[in-house]
């Protein structure tokens, strides 16, 4: 083989956002004829020498950063891009609202507000039906997501998550859906809202070719920033949403 080995790709099927107790498969893909794959969880000493890791039921300690590489002869490839595996449903769901309201005129402005009872400092918003909606939600430190000059393409169903930067791979359950309606236009949205895959049946269908299960491999939790609060759905009082507006 001439030249450096290309780096492999690492993906999570059906998504890198995995509800607790739901299945997920991590799959490392290199060129044909690879001698050996290595899949590792960063910030831990755990790895496996297979291309596929099947997790039948997502657990908190399995959330974190993963990467993989492969060996051809005596050469090791560069590592894949890191994959961030997130466990969702760890904390109670936030609520998502639209200000001034969920019906907005084309050309107007609207702000989607992700409200949480807890002291979370990170928020994620996704629109169902967008490319990879469940895989790559928009994330930042603000609870508000301003949409300036609304168009028909903004119509659709939105959900949000909240989490702590102290443990960025453990997220809340998704909020209830918010339907944003753009009025004053006859243009049909290019994509229809679809529910992200979550059921075992859908998962099995999507990954039917992955027959090898490495459930005997134990991955330990990685070291991460400490969480300053440990919210539980049952014992945290409700309170006003944390606001990020300039006072």
């Amino acid at each position: 083989q001439r030249g450096p080995l290309p780096k492999p790709s690492l993906q999570a099927l059906p998504s890198s956002l995995v509800p607790l107790e739901k299945p997920v498969t991590l799959r490392c893909q290199g060129p044909p004829g690879v001698d050996l794959y290595r899949l590792e969880k960063l910030s831990s000493s755990r790895y496996q020498d297979q291309a596929v890791l099947f997790i039948p039921a997502m657990k908190r300690h399995l959330a974190g950063r993963y990467r993989c590489s492969y060996q051809n002869g005596s050469l090791w490839s560069p590592p894949s891009d890191q994959l961030e595996l997130v466990a969702t449903g760890v904390f109670a769901k936030p609520s998502l609202s639209a200000q001034p309201g969920p019906a907005v005129s084309s050309g107007g402005d609207v702000t989607l507000q992700c409200q949480t009872r807890y002291g979370f400092d990170q928020f994620a918003l996704y629109k169902e039906g967008d490319p990879a909606p469940y895989k790559n939600p928009e994330r930042w430190y603000r609870a508000s997501f301003p949409i300036i000059t609304v168009t028909a393409a903004h119509s659709g169903t939105y959900r949000c998550y909240s989490f702590s930067s102290g443990d960025p791979y453990l997220w809340s359950a998704p909020s209830d859906p918010l339907e944003l309606m753009v009025t004053g236009t006859s243009v049909t949205p290019s994509r229809l809202p679809t529910e992200p895959p979550s059921s075992v049946a859908e998962f099995s269908e999507a990954t039917a070719e992955l027959t090898v299960s490495f459930t005997n491999k134990v991955f330990t939790t990685e070291t991460s920033r400490s969480i300053t609060t440990s919210p539980k759905e049952s014992d945290s009082p409700a309170g006003p949403a944390r606001q990020y507006y300039t006072k």
Partner: antibody, heavy 115, light 111 residues
Framework: VMLVESGGGLVKPGGSLKLSCAAS????????MSWVRQTPEKRLEWVAT????????YYPDSVKGRFTISRDNAKNTLYLQMSSLRSADTAMYYC?????????WGQGTTLTVSS | DIVLTQSPASLAVSLGQRATISCRAS??????????MHWYQQKPGQPPKLLFY???NLESGIPARFSGSGSRTDFTLTINPVETDDVATYYC?????????FGGGTKLEIK
């Protein structure tokens, strides 16, 4: 984690300039990113923030309407387009990974606005 | 905007002694019992480096000689004992309310 800024230089008042920040060592598309500047008097000022996928941006009043933050996740690169520059914009500009606080910073690139 | 006032502007401490830096906010930076105040260290010619996030959470790799405390409007960064490597300027920053703001900095020198 590595962040490398470029594009600084000397610009006349009213001029424009675009800064870039190349990111590596982390999943760039999963993180909000920001620009923070440091004046010659060593004061730190937050300049702009963009959400992980690039759909949402936020600016302080001091730069709103003049600066535009953007990102190319395929290239792992953050940008800051600056226009209508003023002498008060003279500073070292840092890109930083953003958690509300800034846990990783680049080495910075210097902008001087002077006639 | 929330104004963060650091004091003193500079201080000189003997090696092995305690250095205490204060940051006072013009209004509370707390929410849900969490203080959205953060601390950075900046050495000459380098970018700022995160020391603490949310008042008292020590960033990975930072020595335990550093401690952060406080709530609402009054926050303290303590270095005990001070070492030569600690010579730097220290900044506080709040993220409870936009726009996010920084303190003016405290320059630490060795006596």
């Amino acid at each position: 984690v590595m962040l490398v800024e470029s594009g600084g230089g000397l610009v006349k008042p009213g001029g424009s300039l675009k800064l870039s920040c190349a990111a590596s060592g982390f999943t760039f598309s999963s993180y909000a990113m920001s620009w923070v500047r440091q004046t010659p008097e060593k004061r730190l000022e937050w300049v702009a923030t963009i959400s992980s996928g690039g759909s949402y941006t936020y600016y302080p009043d001091s730069v709103k309407g003049r600066f535009t933050i953007s990102r190319d996740n395929a290239k792992n690169t953050l940008y800051l387009q600056m226009s209508s520059l003023r002498s008060a914009d003279t500073a070292m500009y840092y890109c930083a990974r953003d958690y509300g606080y800034f846990d990783y910073w680049g080495q910075g690139t210097t902008l001087t606005v002077s006639s | 905007d929330i104004v963060l006032t650091q004091s003193p502007a500079s201080l000189a401490v003997s090696l092995g002694q305690r250095a205490t830096i204060s940051c006072r906010a013009s209004e509370s930076v707390d929410n849900y019992g969490i203080s959205f105040m953060h601390w950075y260290q900046q050495k000459p010619g380098q970018p700022p480096k995160l020391l603490f996030y949310r008042a008292s959470n020590l960033e990975s790799g930072i020595p335990a000689r550093f401690s952060g405390s406080g709530s609402r409007t009054d926050f303290t960064l303590t270095i005990n004992p001070v070492e030569t490597d600690d010579v730097a300027t220290y900044y506080c920053q709040q993220s409870n309310t936009d726009p996010r703001t920084f303190g003016g900095g405290t320059k630490l020198e060795i006596k």
